[in-house]
């Protein structure tokens, strides 16, 4: 085990978040670990416990402030270590100089609203959640609109390459049931990922009057 | 790509010191880890020592514990071995290595998370 595939990773939600996963092959499932964060210049210290979110994988979400504030800034370094109780003592399995903004994945988009709505065409927005300012523009957007008859996995993506907070889809089919759902990226980092998708936002398109194509 | 370039290597005898660097060069990374690695004749390569990005983290093994210490400089973009009390079986080549995941700890060091090697150096230690 000690030569297996462990991974220890870690995203910084750019405010006052970081979410680890933790696995390890042949790990018992009912071992106690946590995540410990030591900033390097800053006073506080955090730890989470680690819970199993499948056979060989654990997760924990330390929690460093208020949900906007902004605890950590592109100089922060955090060195977190995964700590696993052996008999009395706590062993240290795995240890990184974590680099915030090299490691980011927002919060998924929040408030979706289908802004207007026509046969072909549908205007839908969004907000962001919890994303610094330090940003400032510095953002883009992927976008999926579910048809029916298809899978999410089957649906193009659409890409924003901007802080862009809306959508106008169209080539729409009248009277007809779709779901939308956006993800949104910083520019900034290395190991930069896509935010989870936003929950998806249902709408209608309006039916096409009889005897004319509107 | 990545250059790595290590020196220090010599002949010493049991109970000495000797100080290995690994000078780093090319790409770079946001927040690596580096290692040592050691070969000797007829043996599998075995890990060191580890240490991460910043150097507030590091992982020995066993049979080095206590006698090596890894340091790194990373404004010379250099990372050090301090041997000391060295052993005839401490005698092997000794290689530094680079993992772009920046992850280190008893479960990372099986030397396929090490993607850029050096060409090693040879540490001798007679008794």
């Known amino acids: 085990a000690v030569n297996g595939t462990s991974q220890f990773t870690c995203f910084y939600n750019s405010r006052a978040n970081i979410s680890c996963v933790w696995s390890q092959d042949g790990a018992l499932q009912d071992t106690s670990c946590q995540v410990h964060a030591w900033p390097d210049r800053r006073r506080w210290n955090q730890t989470c416990e680690l819970l199993p979110v499948s056979q060989a994988s654990w997760a924990c979400n330390l929690i460093l402030g208020a949900p906007d504030s902004q605890k950590l800034t592109t100089v922060d370094i955090v060195t977190l270590r995964v700590l696993c109780r052996e008999g009395v003592r706590w062993r240290v399995m795995a240890i990184q100089d974590f680099k915030p903004f090299e490691n980011l994945r927002l919060m998924a988009p929040i408030s979706l609203q289908v802004v207007h709505v026509e046969t072909h065409r549908c205007n839908i927005s969004w907000e962001i959640s919890q994303a610094s300012h330090y940003f400032e523009r510095h953002l883009e957007f992927e976008a999926r609109t579910l048809s029916p008859g298809h899978t999410w996995e089957e649906a193009p993506l659409l890409t924003l390459k901007q802080k862009q907070e809306w959508i106008c889809l169209e080539t729409l089919t009248p009277d007809t049931q779709y779901e939308f759902q956006v993800r949104v990226k910083p520019l900034q980092g290395e190991f930069t990922t896509w935010s989870p998708w936003s929950q998806p936002l249902a709408f209608r398109t309006k039916p096409a009057a009889l005897g004319k194509d509107t | 790509q990545v250059q790595l370039v290590e020196s220090g290597g010599g002949l010493v005898q049991a109970g000495g010191s000797l100080r290995l660097s690994c000078a780093a060069s090319?790409?770079?990374?946001?927040?690596?880890?580096k290692g040592w690695f050691r070969q000797a004749p007829g043996k599998e390569r075995e890990f060191v020592a580890a240490?991460?990005?910043?150097?507030?983290?590091?992982d020995y093994a066993d049979s080095v514990k206590g006698r090596f210490t890894i340091t790194r400089d990373n404004a010379k973009n250099m990372v050090y071995l301090q041997m000391s009390n060295l052993k005839p079986e401490d005698t092997a080549v000794y290689y530094c290595?680079?993992?772009?995941?920046?992850?280190?700890?008893?479960?990372?060091?099986?030397?396929?998370?090490?993607?850029?090697w050096g060409q090693g150096t040879q540490v001798t230690v007679s008794s």
């Open positions: 090319g790409r770079t990374f946001s927040s690596d880890a």
């Open positions: 290595a680079l993992n772009p995941e920046g992850v280190i700890g008893p479960y990372f060091r099986n030397s396929n998370r090490y993607n850029y």
């Open positions: 240490i991460t990005w910043a150097g507030r983290g590091t």
